[in-house]
Interface confidence: low
């Protein structure tokens, strides 16, 4: 079998197209994850056979191993297979998704096994952690396979960092047959429920065939007993669970639910507890808000983020000037709301390459049938200063008048300065600042207008020079938090001709 290009490993750009050809002396085919992807098989003029696999518009999900094999109808004598591995680095995808069966790792006795957490990018650093303690374990990692070593009967997670985001894998459960110690975990479908909704709590035991489950829960105090359901979970006989299900929760069901597990044979036991809150009505509460005025810079991207706590999950709307915003197909704005935990959410509005027209009044509303919050703020778009005009005039009274007009957001400041030695300024000589002079040699008048439609300030500053007896370089400088801009003009006495 011959694969072209030969590999054995490829790193592809996301959304790219990649063509793999496999050739052999008999009919061949490509396999991926025990599936046969769509491919084009052919018999070549030289009597060899080939199959062409075209991967189009690849995503992180195309990461994995690909095998070229002889068609399985040809019998065991043609059992050769060739493997290549493809990575498609995808920053939006953390670890490659796993089937639930792959999360339960069966080991007989003490043998080496692999925790198969894999990422799409071979450059990422991946660490393995015991779930309870956040210390990385020193186990060799192969980006194509995962972590291989001898593992105790514990739960493990893999971690990596994508950009500035730490990403966790699913939890992997490793257990050996005939484990005698008890390892209990308790989890609830939801730890916060409204009255009338159901409470479902699972108590899971690893590695024992013969166990007793004993529950304590708030209802017991009033003598109302709930019959738990016992189950083999996820299809592994040595993983047993007890499910406590209360179909209609009452406020008095709030409290601690404890699962005590004992091994009948030697009474060795363990217990775990979980707290459940039953609330009268749902709620929405802001946790992290925005200021009354938020600043964005022209042509830069800006993320506006609100963190809130809610149950049940609310609907979230963003509005601008009381009109609902939606993801624009043009990618000018992106809206997203995601879970940070069971009841904590973060909602983001990302303005891509901010435009002046995006300044205005924004509101975020988070609401469900029981509650609502809203948060409003003004978005100010800061625009760099531009000097649009610097002109001079010679009124009949012998004065020299220089007018400087410019725009920007926030409001620009005006600074006038002069320099008398034309040969040496402005580079070699600091200009002299000007203002309203006590000797009345100069007079300054500045007017500011806010242009609503352009959401920026216009500054018009007029400098009147009473008497000019030699050529002067006059500079008008406008500055705001976004930077500055200036222009210069040379003013000559009335008696001298213009150059």
């Amino acid at each position: 079998l011959v694969i072209t290009p030969p590999g054995p490993e490829f790193v592809l750009n996301i959304s790219s197209t990649f063509v793999l050809t496999c050739s052999g002396s008999a009919p061949v085919m490509w396999e991926q994850m025990s599936q046969v992807p769509w491919q084009e098989a052919a018999m070549n003029q030289d009597g060899t056979f080939s199959s062409v696999l075209t991967l189009t518009n690849v995503t992180g999900g195309d990461t994995g191993e690909y095998f070229c094999v002889y068609n399985n109808s040809l019998g065991p004598e043609l059992s050769e297979r060739k493997r290549i591995y493809i990575f498609v680095p995808d920053p939006t995808m953390g670890f490659l998704p796993m089937d639930s069966e792959d999360l339960f790792i069966f080991v007989t006795d003490v043998t080496e096994t692999t925790i198969p957490c894999r990422v799409t990018d071979p450059q990422l650093e991946v660490t393995l952690h015991e779930k309870k303690v956040d210390i990385p374990l020193h186990v060799p990692y192969d980006h194509q396979r995962g972590f291989t070593g001898t593992f105790e009967d514990k739960t493990y997670i893999c971690k990596t960092t994508i950009g500035d985001r730490e990403v966790d894998s699913d939890t992997y459960y490793v257990y050996s047959l005939q484990v005698s110690s008890i390892n209990v975990s308790v989890n609830a479908v939801q730890t916060v429920v409204r009255q009338g909704e159901s409470i479902t709590i699972r108590c899971i035991v690893m590695g024992n065939d013969v166990v007793n489950f004993q529950w304590t829960y708030p209802r017991m105090k009033s003598g109302r007993l709930v019959e738990p359901v016992t189950d083999y979970l996820f299809g592994v006989p040595s993983r047993i669970g007890s499910i406590l299900h209360i179909p209609t929760a009452e406020l008095s069901d709030s409290g601690t639910y404890t699962c005590n597990v004992s091994v009948s044979v030697n009474d060795h036991g363990d217990e775990k507890a979980i707290n459940i809150s039953v609330i009268e009505n749902g709620y929405v509460r802001l946790l992290e808000t925005l200021g009354d005025v938020e600043i964005a810079e022209l042509h830069r991207s800006r993320t506006l983020r609100v963190v809130f706590e809610a149950y049940p999950m609310p609907s979230v709307l963003w509005l601008k000037d009381n009109r609902t915003l939606g993801d624009s197909g043009a990618g000018e704005l992106v809206l997203s709301t995601r879970n940070m935990s069971e009841t904590r959410y973060v909602s983001e509005l990302i303005l891509v390459r901010v435009k002046v027209s995006e300044a205005g009044y924004y509101t975020m509303r988070a609401f469900h049938e029981d509650d609502e919050v809203q948060l409003s703020f003004k978005l100010q778009v800061n625009v760099p200063v531009r000097v649009l005009e610097l002109s001079e005039s010679h009124p009949a009274n012998g004065e020299q008048t220089i007018r400087c007009r410019g725009r920007g957001m926030p409001q620009p400041n005006v600074t006038w300065s002069t320099c008398r030695d034309l040969k040496r300024c402005p580079r070699k000589l600091s200009p002299t600042p000007l203002g309203n002079s006590s000797k009345e040699e100069s007079q300054l008048e500045t007017n500011v207008t806010f242009w609503e439609e352009d959401q920026e300030y216009e500054v018009v500053s007029t400098l009147r020079l009473r008497h000019v007896d030699q050529p002067l370089s006059v500079r008008c400088m406008l500055q705001n938090s976004m930077g500055g801009d200036s222009q210069e003009v040379t003013v000559v006495p009335h008696s001298l001709p213009f150059k």
Partner: nanobody, 116 residues
């Protein structure tokens, strides 16, 4: 004391289907999950799927998805496992199993032989 009694041995042709039953007695049938597990000659135990009769929602191992159907008849306290498109490698002893709180209970096993 929970007892699980399975239907008798079956010989099937490749491509056909088989249906194995498991009748429970001596316990609260609807509130205990029943799993189906098989053991091929010389192999370990392999989980096929299971059902919690009270919730009526079966759960299947991925490799059997689409080929196995598990259902429960509460009126007769019986759980059925049907496997279609049989192949010779499906030859195995099929067990039903449940858990009664202090121990696990197994059916006696049903030998299914797939042969042309």
């Amino acid at each position: 004391q929970v007892q699980l009694v399975q239907s008798g041995a079956e010989v099937k042709k490749p491509g056909s289907s088989v249906r194995v039953s498991c009748k429970a007695s001596g316990g609260t049938f609807s509130r205990h999950a029943i799993s189906w597990v098989r053991q091929a000659p010389g192999q370990g135990l392999e989980w096929i799927g299971g059902i919690l009769p009270i919730l009526k929602t079966p759960n299947y191992a991925q490799r059997f998805q689409g080929r196995v159907t598990i259902n429960a008849d509460e009126s007769t306290s019986t759980v059925y496992m049907e496997m279609s498109s049989l192949r010779s490698e499906d030859t195995a002893v099929y067990y039903c199993a449940t858990h009664g709180g202090d121990r696990s209970y197994w059916g006696q096993g049903t030998l299914v032989t797939v042969s042309s």
